[in-house]
């Protein structure tokens, strides 16, 4: 079998409040009922995890209590958000999608999404 | 379905060799990194070498560089560790793993496999 397909898109600008959203959508090769997905930071090489979790087929995304990430599903499509970014938390954040349950297992990992975070100017103080 | 089987573990004597072999089958993609790996009960699953099927470039842990050798055959898709100078150390189960990665993505970092061999054991005492 050929790699599970796993579409990002290629750029996305986060907000002034350090907010940033984008879609994994995965061709999904049979009926998963469980699904695991993880978003990898790469930058220089080195890659981290940022944040994952594991969902049944039809329910919310379930993120640790202190993740910075919230999500949720429609069919094989993941709708992720990522708080709290500064600008040095630009890179690419990569998805991987494991179908986990019933086997076989797929993997398969998104080519990115370049997030770019631009730190606000702080406001001037006001003579008035 | 995407499977990996290892071979050629053992019992060897510390500075003797052994050479593991992992074929893939299932995966028809031409870009994939493939390595290997190993764990024992006390510590976590560590790389210990690895390739990208495309270009070759490879990877070794810092304490296996100058004695163990990975390579590749894509013909039979099958690669190969050549572990020379084995020591007490080295002992542990050795799995075989795969990425199905693409070019953007960072040469074999363990947080891209997922694809698993069932292990296969080396032992390395007198």
């Known amino acids: 079998c050929k790699a599970m397909h796993v579409a990002q898109p290629a750029v996305v600008l986060a907000s002034s409040r350090g907010i940033a959203s984008f879609v994994c959508e995965y061709a999904s090769p049979g009926k998963a009922t469980e699904v695991r997905v993880t978003v990898l930071r790469q930058a220089d090489s080195q890659v981290t995890e940022v944040c994952a979790a594991t969902y049944m087929m039809g329910n919310e995304l379930t993120f640790l209590d202190d993740s910075i990430c919230t999500g949720t599903s429609s069919g094989n499509q993941v709708n992720l958000t990522i708080q709290g970014l500064r600008a040095m938390d630009t890179g690419l954040y990569i998805c991987k999608v494991e179908l986990m349950y019933p086997p076989p297992y797929y993997l398969g990992i998104g080519n990115g999404t370049q997030i770019y975070v631009i730190d606000p100017e702080p406001c001037p103080d006001s003579d008035f | 379905e995407v499977q990996l089987v290892e071979s050629g573990g053992g019992l060897v004597q510390p500075g003797g060799s052994l050479r593991l072999s992992c074929a893939a089958s299932?995966?028809?993609?031409?870009?994939?990194?493939i390595g290997w790996f190993r764990q024992d009960p006390e510590k976590e699953r560590e790389m210990v070498s690895c390739?990208?099927?495309?270009?070759?470039?490879?990877k070794y842990a810092d304490s296996v560089k100058g004695r163990f050798t990975i390579s590749r055959d894509n013909s039979k898709n099958t690669v190969y560790l050549q572990m020379n100078s084995l020591r007490a150390e080295d002992t542990a189960v050795y799995y075989c793993?795969?990425?199905?990665?693409?070019?953007?993505?960072?040469?074999?970092?363990?947080?891209?496999?997922?694809?698993w061999g069932q292990g296969t054991r080396v032992t390395v005492s007198s």
């Open positions: 299932g995966f028809s993609s031409d870009y994939y990194d």
């Open positions: 793993g795969l990425a199905p990665i693409s070019p953007v993505h960072a040469v074999c970092n363990q947080h891209y496999f997922g694809y």
């Open positions: 390739i990208r099927s495309s270009g070759g470039s490879t």
